[in-house]
């Protein structure tokens, strides 16, 4: 059973998670991003589901493609490198995630604009935050 | 010092068309972004659009994407919007306000929303 | 999109007193660059909108120093030291870090 300080480590670990995402979505969804149009034609792939930690293998599938798409910023839009950022989000997700069950992911039929995917995974963390708290 | 005036308001019914301008003037237009934002009357602030320094970028809220066009004349320091199948509910003052300010770095620098026209009223009735 | 909400609506004060106006953003306004692009706009009646603070806590040119502005992430205020005649309007709170969103407007008036 979950003790309340594992309930508080997983807490704090997805209030970080939706900080990440939160400042990279702030980073490319605004007017003065040169590659914003050119960022949008790329698609991502959204979970069929996503209620529960485990679903966040979904997240993790598709950190590489996030990754190639930041590539495309401006350095000055990120204080830390894509390649720096990426990667902490990475060990945030497989620590909340587990490595103890194997999940596969189930996509939607209909693909995601960077923009899109990015609120659908703030909209998660958000959502598991509250049943936490 | 810096001046922005707005002009092309009126009265005109549902369906019509309107164009309106923004004169600027005591700064180097060319280089800035510039904003459209509107206030229906007694209601708040509501961003309609902007444009890029040299018009190559362009952004529209939702509640006028496809009937509004923003653009602009860097030759003759002006700002424009073509506003298209107007509705009641775009009845409202017309703001336009200054953006950042593209550097030959090429990236964005100052403050959004520093300066401020007058305003010009656009109201759409039968 | 980003959604302002400020509180209160409403404020009542009395000359020479302090006030305080809220503002609380759906998700955080730091920017990928690091900047927190918060800013507070005053609107006079019958006036078009001025802009007061900028980046949570830089005053424009020409503001006086009675408008101080603070916060991080998602919350933040404004306050007037000292609230004069002049400063009775309507005061929006706003966030640039993604497109532009506003507050619905905080009236401030002298009772």
């Known amino acids: 059973a979950p003790t309340s300080s594992s309930t508080k480590k997983t807490q704090l670990q997805l209030e970080h998670l939706l900080l990440d995402l939160q400042m990279i979505l702030n980073g490319i969804n605004n007017y003065k991003n040169p590659k914003l149009t050119r960022m949008l034609t790329f698609k991502f792939y959204m979970p069929k589901k996503a209620t529960e930690l485990k679903h966040l293998q979904c997240l993790e599938e598709e950190l590489k493609p996030l990754e190639e798409v930041l590539n495309l910023a401006q350095s000055k839009n990120f204080h830390l490198r894509p390649r720096d950022l990426i990667s902490n989000i990475n060990v945030i997700v497989l620590e909340l995630k587990g490595s103890e069950t194997t999940f596969m992911c189930e996509y939607a039929d209909e693909t995601a604009t960077i923009v899109e995917f990015l609120n659908r995974w703030i909209t998660f963390c958000q959502s598991i935050i509250s049943t936490l708290t | 010092q810096v001046q922005l005036v707005e002009s092309g308001g009126g009265v005109v019914q549902p369906g019509r068309s309107l164009r309106l301008s923004c004169a600027a003037s005591?700064?180097?237009?060319?280089?800035?972004?510039m904003h459209w934002v509107r206030q229906a009357p007694g209601k708040g602030l509501e961003w309609v659009t902007v444009?890029?320094?040299?018009?190559?970028?362009?952004y529209y809220a939702d509640s006028v994407k496809g009937r509004f066009t923003i653009s602009r004349d860097n030759s003759k320091n002006t700002l424009y919007l073509q506003m298209n199948s107007l509705r009641a509910e775009d009845t409202a003052v017309y703001y336009c306000?200054?953006?950042?300010?593209?550097?030959?770095?090429?990236?964005?620098?100052?403050?959004?929303?520093?300066?401020w026209g007058q305003g010009t009223t656009v109201t759409v009735s039968s | 999109d980003i959604v302002m909400t400020q509180t209160p609506l409403s404020s009542p004060v009395t000359l020479g007193q302090p006030a305080s106006i809220s503002c609380r953003s759906s998700?955080?306004?730091?920017?990928?660059?690091?900047?927190?692009?918060l800013s507070w706009l005053q609107q006079r009646p019958g006036q078009p909108p001025r802009l007061l603070i900028y980046?949570?806590?830089n005053r424009f040119s020409g503001v006086p120093d009675r408008f101080s502005g603070s916060g991080a992430g998602t919350d933040f205020t404004l306050k007037i030291s000292r609230v004069e005649a002049e400063d009775v309007g309507v005061y929006y709170c706003?966030?640039?870090?993604?497109?532009?969103?506003f507050g619905q407007g905080t009236k401030v008036e002298i009772k």
């Open positions: 306000a200054r953006g950042s300010y593209y550097d030959s770095s090429g990236y964005y620098f100052g403050e959004d929303f520093d300066y």
């Open positions: 444009i890029w320094y040299d018009g190559s970028n362009e």
């Open positions: 980046k949570i806590s």
């Open positions: 706003m966030q640039v870090t993604q497109f532009p969103t």
């Open positions: 005591g700064f180097t237009f060319s280089i800035y972004g």
């Open positions: 998700q955080s306004l730091v920017h990928s660059d690091g900047n927190t692009y």
